[in-house]
């Protein structure tokens, strides 16, 4: 929605008694006008348990919810209850436009209650406010990573949250590094997870009316030391025409810091191998993985002399891996000629 547009649910007609929970995203500064029930007999609007006054920047008036200019603190849950009864006519959550795209999902709107307001809506058992943030149930996380579980909920009275691990109360006292419980964000954070953190994490959300629970299943994957893994098929055999540019690609995966070299196989005194049995090579490029574009070997304006075998060699503290490919260079005048190159080699 553009900031200039007004958010409207529908004209103030007779209410639907099958009003489903809705979520509306509103841009900051945008006016909001939501209706509930007929104008004269419109319902009462409540925000986070407090009845809205008929005057002010955010007001509930003759069945209408009106916000002159939407601000971050206006985000939250709004209910419209029928006059003279506890029937919910509207049940919706307003979200600030940024909050859906923000990568920091900690910024949940806080409840803004007016303690002097005595018109509170009826008691309600806990319910999940953002179930879409809880959809990922099974977690497989490498050791050392940070894990965050969230169970955003609401209810009236405001529910409390407790965490269990494998069915037992969990406060993190036996965990190196402890845990961070952020009750206002309904979250549990564990930094630098280790295998002993594996298990079932249950958030238990309770108030006087009822309780709900949700399980997260956590697996911690041990980092098994291995030498670099090179993606199969890379570098690939390549055919190029004299004068063209060539790129050879090598994809390297390694937990331990890898070191990469690009080598060209050369012939010395008519031989490709030295007395030690190793091939003669010329080092074309060498760097660590975090160097920019180290995994690509660029050959500019290739000539017939550039033809031959090229090797991507990757090593770390555990060992070496390499894969090779052939570059065939065709003369400019006869681009239809092709030569069968040997298959690329893949070694462990």
């Amino acid at each position: 929605l553009e900031a200039s547009e007004e958010v409207e649910l529908e004209p103030c007609l007779a209410p639907s008694l099958e009003q489903q929970e809705q979520e509306l995203t509103v841009a900051l500064g945008q006016p909001v006008r939501l209706c509930c029930g007929r104008a004269e007999r419109g319902g009462h609007w409540y925000k986070e348990g407090s009845r809205l006054a008929p005057a002010g920047r955010v007001r509930g008036w003759r069945g209408r919810l009106e916000i002159a200019s939407f601000l971050p603190e206006d985000a939250g849950r709004y209910l419209c209850l029928a006059r003279g009864s506890m029937i919910v006519l509207q049940n919706l959550t307003l979200i600030t436009g940024d909050s859906l795209t923000s990568s920091n999902d900690d910024e949940d709107p806080k409840s803004h209650r007016d303690p002097s307001n005595r018109h509170s809506y009826p008691q309600q058992a806990p319910y999940w406010t953002h179930p879409q943030r809880m959809e990922k149930k099974l977690h497989a996380v490498p050791a050392g990573n940070t894990v965050k579980f969230r169970c955003p909920a609401a209810g009236n009275p405001t529910p409390t949250i407790r965490w269990l691990k494998d069915g037992q109360a969990f406060h993190g006292e036996n965990r190196i590094g402890g845990i961070r419980l952020r009750h206002q964000h309904w979250s549990l954070v564990m930094e630098s997870v280790v295998p002993s953190d594996r298990g079932t994490y249950t958030c238990l959300v309770e108030n006087a009316v009822g309780s709900i629970r949700y399980n997260y299943l956590l697996d911690v994957l041990e980092r098994s030391p291995h030498r670099p893994i090179l993606q199969a098929g890379l570098p690939a055999n390549t055919t190029a025409v004299v004068g063209s540019d060539v790129e050879l690609l090598c994809k390297v995966y390694s937990d331990a810091q890898p070191h990469i070299q690009w080598l060209k196989h050369i012939v010395i005194n008519g031989s490709s191998f030295g007395a030690d049995g190793f091939p003669y090579v010329q080092v074309l490029k060498t760097a660590d993985i975090n160097s920019s574009e180290v995994e690509v070997l660029y050959l500019r304006n290739v000539s017939a002399e550039d033809a031959g075998e090229y090797t991507c060699l990757a090593g770390n503290s555990i060992g070496l891996s390499y894969q090779s490919a052939w570059l065939t260079v065709l003369p400019e005048e006869d681009p239809t000629w092709t030569a069968a190159a040997p298959e690329a080699r893949y070694t462990d």
Epitope: W128, P131, M134, E135, K136, K137, L138, H139, A140, G167, P195, R198, G199, T200, T202, I212, R213, Y214, N215, L217, L218, D219, V220, L221, E222
Partner: antibody
Framework: EVQLLESGGGLVQPGGSLRLSCAAS????????MSWVRQAPGKGLEWVSA????????YYADSVKGRFTISRDNSKNTLYLQMNSLRAEDTAVYYC???????????WGQGTLVTVSS | QSVLTQPPSASGTPGQRVTISCSGS????????VNWYQQLPGTAPKLLIY???QRPSGVPDRFSGSKSGTSASLAISGLRSEDEADYYC?????????????FGGGTKLTVL
């Protein structure tokens, strides 16, 4: 391409034991949650057990708790189900399935039939 | 008896729209996403819908899923003879006994 191939089914007497295997390929087995689901002849699907990628966490249906054990050998890309104290009601086709992070079984094996009968 | 409740059978004629319901409780469908599986005669089940309404690649958009509260439904529009199969809903259950997967009893869909 993800492939799951069950084996080890057969006829066994009540009170007997059987071990099912599921050979996996086409994905990083050691990171994947895996599960067993069974289907009695002419009946619906019933979840049996699940295991985390590391093997450090296991889960069971109440109907098999204490009798069945799920395990895995990541070096062999193989999932197992050790079934002890078998009963007639354990007769079913047993499917091996990969669990995705949202909790769904996104790939299934073709199943292996276990018959418990005297 | 299955934890999730489905009608045992459903039917429709080619081209019709058919809906299959799945009812649960707050500890399963109410808190967890719903998945749907199709089992063609004599074959293994296949994932049809995950995360309430998401289709895996290769599943036609004639199949759609939805969830509201503690119930879910699978809709099949433009019914075809090859849709004749058993359909199962499933969800994780977070009851006091610990996590478990629960299935519906299955709905046998007949294309008339």
């Amino acid at each position: 391409e993800v492939q799951l191939l069950e084996s080890g089914g057969g006829l066994v007497q009540p009170g007997g034991s059987l071990r099912l295997s599921c050979a996996a390929s086409g994905f990083t087995f050691s990171k994947a949650w895996m599960s067993w689901v069974r289907q009695a002849p002419g009946k619906g699907l019933e979840w049996v057990s699940a295991i985390s990628g590391s093997g450090g966490s296991t889960y069971y249906a109440d109907s098999v708790k204490g009798r069945f054990t799920i395990s895995r050998d990541n070096s062999k890309n193989t999932l197992y189900l050790q079934m002890n104290s078998l009963r007639a009601e354990d007769t079913a086709v047993y499917y091996c399935a990969r669990l995705y992070s949202y909790g769904d079984f996104d790939h299934w094996g073709q199943g292996t039939l276990v018959t418990v009968s005297s | 008896q299955s934890v999730l409740t489905q009608p045992p059978s459903a039917s429709g004629t080619p081209g019709q729209r058919v809906t299959i319901s799945c009812s649960g409780s707050s500890s399963n469908i109410g808190s967890n996403t719903v998945n749907w599986y199709q089992q063609l005669p004599g074959t293994a089940p296949k994932l049809l819908i995950y995360r309430n309404n998401q289709r895996p690649s290769g599943v036609p958009d004639r199949f759609s899923g939805s969830k509201s509260g503690t119930s879910a439904s699978l809709a099949i529009s433009g019914l075809r003879s090859e849709d004749e199969a058993d359909y199962y809903c499933a969800a994780w259950d977070d009851s006091l006994n610990g996590p478990a997967v629960v299935f519906g009893g299955g709905t046998k869909l007949t294309v008339l």
